[in-house]
């Protein structure tokens, strides 16, 4: 016969067992709580820091863009792409048609004050979008120039000049003294580029990357 | 509802489910142990009761004939 | 890690925890049920075994002396 366990020993064993089980339960719940807290607090901190970042980003832009128009990018609530309110958006850029008549250098400076550059046209689709907002009887500076007058055209943002993606009017460029490019309308060829003197005041088109907040 | 909000709602549901199930599991485990002890006492020693194997995360109920 | 990614990871952890605990709980419950039946058979009717009260979400192990 196995010696019988005393009732108090059994009670003690049960008590220890209960303690162990409830300890496990508490630890499990604590771990769950930690996880849950992390998922709630961290995102809030994340959101908070993101909001702070957003606000500072907005403050950065506020000096020259008092209001932004933002749209949600994709499904993610946090990714907003914004353009300054009077600007138009296309793909990942914002565009602004400046109706003030200024020289090429002044136009570029004017764009850069707004955090932009004179427009760099990379595709036919982009040009097609831009011309929708232009007036046929006006000319607009592009971010394209040949300061040396040696036909080494260069874009203001250092994008390589690709001869295959240019939209010059026929016979243009045609003058080594005309070192800045405009986009204008010719009834025979519709919209295209022309070289003109940089000091001649023209309207202009500014382009900037969308602001992601 | 946006995707992230949905995720947090699911988090809360799973969290509550986890807590409730943890409590139920622990309660059941203790009841099993208590029942085993009660069973031992009431059967006047005919059976040794439930044997506990601590190395397992769960408990197996096992009746053995005591050595005669 | 981004905010949503963190939420999805936590979802996965809670989901796995819920599944594991559900399985353990069910297993324990089945073992309790089996043990009750075994206990009843082995005691040659001395005890009625475990009585189940279906209205409860959990099961209470209870030995009752059969009516004499």
């Amino acid at each position: 016969m196995v010696p019988e366990e005393e009732p108090q020993d059994r009670e003690k064993g049960l008590w220890w067992f209960q303690l162990k089980v409830w300890s496990m339960a508490v630890v499990s719940i604590l771990l769950l709580s930690v996880c849950f807290t992390v998922s709630s607090v961290v995102p809030h901190n994340f959101m908070y820091s993101k909001t702070v970042k957003r606000l500072s980003k907005l403050r950065e832009y506020q000096q020259y863009h008092p209001s932004l128009t933002c749209v949600m990018e994709g499904k993610d609530i946090e990714d907003w792409s914004c353009c300054p309110t009077p600007w138009t958006s296309f793909q990942s850029s914002c565009y602004f048609i400046s109706t003030g008549m200024q020289s090429w250098t002044k136009s570029q400076k004017n764009c850069s004050v707004m955090g932009a550059d004179l427009v760099v046209i990379n595709t036919r689709e982009e040009q097609d979008f831009i011309i929708q907002n232009l007036k046929r009887n006006s000319s607009y500076f592009l971010g394209l120039s040949d300061p040396g007058g040696r036909r080494h055209w260069q874009w203001v943002d250092q994008t390589p000049y690709n001869e295959n993606v240019t939209f010059w009017h026929s016979g243009e460029p045609n003058n080594l003294d005309e070192r800045c490019a405009i986009i204008n309308f010719r009834s025979s060829e519709e919209w295209g580029w022309n070289d003109i003197h940089c000091h001649v005041p023209q309207k202009s088109i500014c382009k900037m990357k969308k602001i992601y907040i | 509802l946006g995707e992230p909000q949905l995720c947090y709602i699911l988090d809360a549901i799973l969290f509550l489910y986890g807590i409730v199930l943890t409590l139920l599991y622990c309660r059941l485990k203790i009841q099993v142990r208590k029942a085993a002890i009660t069973s031992y006492e009431k059967s006047d020693g005919v059976y040794t009761g439930l044997s506990t194997r601590n190395q397992e995360t769960y408990e197996t109920l096992k009746h053995e004939k005591p050595p005669q | 890690l981004g905010e949503p990614q963190l939420c999805y990871i936590l979802d996965a952890i809670l989901f796995l925890y819920g599944i594991v605990l559900t399985l353990l709980y069910c297993r324990l419950k089945i073992q309790v049920r089996k043990a009750a039946i075994t206990s009843y058979e082995k005691s040659d009717g001395v005890y009625t075994g475990l009585s189940t009260r279906n209205q409860e979400t959990y099961e209470t192990l209870k030995h009752e002396k059969p009516p004499q």
Epitope: S103, K109, G149, N175, D177, R179, H199, V200 | - | -
Partner: antibody, heavy 121, light 111 residues
Amino acid sequence: EVQLVESGGGLVKPGGSLRLSCAASGFTFSSYGMSWVRQAPGKGLEWVSTISSGDSYTYYPDSVKGRFTISRDNAKNSLYLQMNSLRAEDTAVYYCARQIYYDYAYYFDFWGQGTTVTVSS
Amino acid sequence: DIVLTQSPASLAVSPGQRATITCRASESVSFRTSHLMHWYQQKPGQPPKLLIYGASNLESGVPARFSGSGSETDFTLTINPVEAEDTANYFCQQSIEDPPTFGGGTKVEIK
């Protein structure tokens, strides 16, 4: 040798007209933008008008806009300035100057000797 | 219009000394590395003559004692050493944008 010779100046009554000419030689006239610059007695230099090499662009300051017209005849290597509705303040020595482009701007590398215009009653 | 302000209005220098003339623009006449200010010399009864273009480039045939410097809004013409034949009026000019404008001139006299 580059040479620019102005002519056509003289005395004219207020409201009158004059046509100044500038004969260019020693360079390919049709390849250069040209300007007229004036200097009132004892004063500084004041730009009056510009014409591009291909005749596609002309420009004037507000002080002469609508009254003065710049033109060129590349076949004759000549630059002209038609001045109408002349005023006393138009009295000055008028220089024709050749433009040289430098980066985004230009300067005047050669100047003629000038022709004097006097507007007086 | 861009206003160019020259100083001093007149300057008397001994031969062999340095003469410094400044020209201040009402706004920048530089673009990146291009400084679009030019300097002319005009002797009495003669047309202006180009000395310096692009702020610091010496026109061919101009003596090396003439030099130019500056960027954005502040530019300087230096004559060192001054010679008797340098008696003249000196003008700065910008044409980064139309209308091209000239400074009021600085009269340099040799003592």
